[in-house]
Amino acid sequence: AITEAREEAKPYPLFPGPLPGSLQTDHTSLLSLPHTSGYQPALMFSPTQPGRPYTGNVAIPRVTSAGSKLLPPLAFKHTVGHIILSEHKDVKFNCSISVPNIYQDTTISWWKDGKELLGAHHAITQFYPDDEVTAIIASFSITSVQRSDNGSYICKMKINNEEIVSDPIYIEVQGLPHFTKQPESMNVTRNTAFNLTCQAVGPPEPVNIFWVQNSSRVNEQPEKSPSVLTVPGLTEMAVFSCEAHNDKGLTVSKGVQINIKAIPSPPTEVSIHNSTAHSILISWVPGFDGYSPFRNCSVQVKEVDPLSNGSVMIFNTSASPHMYQIKQLQALANYSIGVSCMNEIGWSAVSPWILASTTEGAPSVAPLNVTVFLNESRDNVDIRWMKPLTKRQAGELVGYRISHVWQSAGISKELLEEVGQNNSRAQISVQVHNATCTVRIAAVTKGGVGPFSDPVKIFIPAHGWVDHAPSSTPAPGNADPVLII
């Protein structure tokens, strides 16, 4: 792989063969010595002769006990300072140092942009022992470099709690422009200006931008990245992209569709889910939103009746969920229902109309003339009433519901009885004596239970006290009838 090197100082030669710290253009090991260790900083062993020192970040050794002679300061030797290469190439670089043999347990570590490189990196440390010093060469290789490998690499060595740091080696990976911001799809109002943004980076810089609309270039002269394209307005959908150019070539962004907002399509599949006497639950499938979110919907209801005036009831509702309960309808009636929805541009057409019917309703009036009296010989309460006058919409009478509440000594119990539609009288068992029984009656149709009649109270004496006088529903104006024994 061809690798460019730019540096201010040449490394000092120490050994024959490949220079420690010099730029590698092949990808073989520097040396094949027995004392090598891959992927880990390694211990120093035998002595060797020192190379010429570098006066940067140095450690000053103490006087040796043996010969009382001063050892030279320790420093990493100069190495290549800047490596430029293309993406996906391989690279190898190194740093070297000569260490007197008096120092034990010396380790070299690699750091990138201030963080130690741990784990499965291709770092190899090799040792060249001599009588007094050991030359250490730490090499670092990267296969198929990526932009993320860009940065400043250094070697560090700790000796006697002192840290020696090498000169940085700057790795610059060059390649095609890389997009940091691409244009985004948009939905825009017809003939309204909007902006698109495109940004790409190298290295190498500079990066120039061309805009493309529907496969045709928009700008004849490139703009330096980042670039903002102002489109004065569109009348129909268009596809935009941008081209980023640098010395390595060009990269094309994704194509983005710019849609023109329009009124929605009408809803489809209006369905009836549930009908009661006075309400209908509907749902619908929204039509196409016209590239603009639905805001709300309108449910339109017409009574299908030759005698009705054909007026339309309109119920506004939120666009989601696609469901609405239409209320306040007549019982046992037929309706035509349509749905329309709107976005910021306007209302859709109305969906296809569907027919729906309400069910029969509950009675709207209570039974009349309710009379209650005690039949003590049988321990029964006799109840009589008159059938209410119900409207056609209430449906067919199926029976009556009788509520009887028994109260005595602070205790109260409500019981319910059902009787058939042909009855206008009923008998209920006395539940308890020396108590008040309160009776109410409601008419029942398939549509439900109607209102209860006004309460009628009768006192049930202790067993053996005979009194047959009835209680009855009061005339209008009287509030709470009580039979006084």
Epitope: S408, E414, V432, A462, H463
Partner: antibody, heavy 118, light 107 residues
């Protein structure tokens, strides 16, 4: 087969609150009134109060100021709380079922002896 | 409130004999009266309701009678398992109430 299973603290000090729970297993909870009764040692039975599945309650007037009966229909359980107990509240406490309209107790729990002593 | 008085307090009989237990109400209870049997360490068991109706599963030797204020529980021929305490109970007026009980013991 419907069963009533009851539990709660068996030993209380005066002025504490008695608390018992009764669970209904294997049968319907609605359509009945659910009662608590008690029987002091060697004496007769006394009705304390009742609750329906819908939560409507009735209490014996002599105990009303101290009694609370509650229901948890999701668990088919009902509970009794009797506050400010004295030695006179020492008894076997029973839970029982009654048809809503005839008020005869046709199903009973096994009873819990509650002793109030300082 | 209706007070129920049972008599006798204790009744000593032998198996095979006829037992007659009495319950008197302080006011008329109509026929809204029941009888319960209770054995030591057990909960009461419903025998008779509405004065004369046998509850489900109760043997025919148990019968009830009476109306108003005087009620009777009769066991036609005593079996060993019938020796227990018997309570009458009224639901005619609220609050409902029980008698103090009759102990039926083996002679």
């Amino acid at each position: 087969q419907v069963q009533l299973q009851q539990w709660g603290a068996g030993l209380l000090k005066p002025s504490e609150t008695l608390s018992l729970t009764c669970a209904v297993y294997g049968g319907s909870f609605s359509g009945y009134y659910w009662s608590w009764l008690r029987q002091p040692p060697g004496k007769g039975l006394e009705w304390i109060g009742e609750i329906s599945h819908s939560g409507s309650t009735n209490y014996n007037p002599s105990l009303k100021s101290r009694v609370t009966i509650s229901v948890d229909t999701s668990k088919n359980q009902f509970s009794l709380k009797l506050s400010s107990v004295t030695a006179a509240d020492t008894a076997v406490y029973y839970c029982a079922r009654a048809l809503s309209r005839y008020w005869y107790f046709d199903l009973w729990g096994r009873g819990t002896l509650v002793t109030v002593s300082s | 409130e209706i007070v129920l008085t049972q008599s006798p307090a204790t009744l000593s009989l032998s198996p095979g004999e006829r037992a007659t237990l009495s319950c008197r109400a302080s006011q008329s209870a109509s026929n809204y009266l029941a009888w319960y049997q209770q054995k030591p360490g057990q909960a009461p068991r419903l025998l008779i309701y509405d004065a004369s109706n046998r509850a489900t599963g109760i043997p025919a030797r148990f019968s009830g009678s009476g109306s108003g204020t005087d009620f009777t529980l009769t066991i036609s021929s005593l079996e060993p398992e019938d020796f227990a305490v018997y309570y009458c109970y009224q639901r005619s007026q609220w609050p409902i109430s029980f008698g103090q009980g009759t102990r039926l013991e083996i002679k």
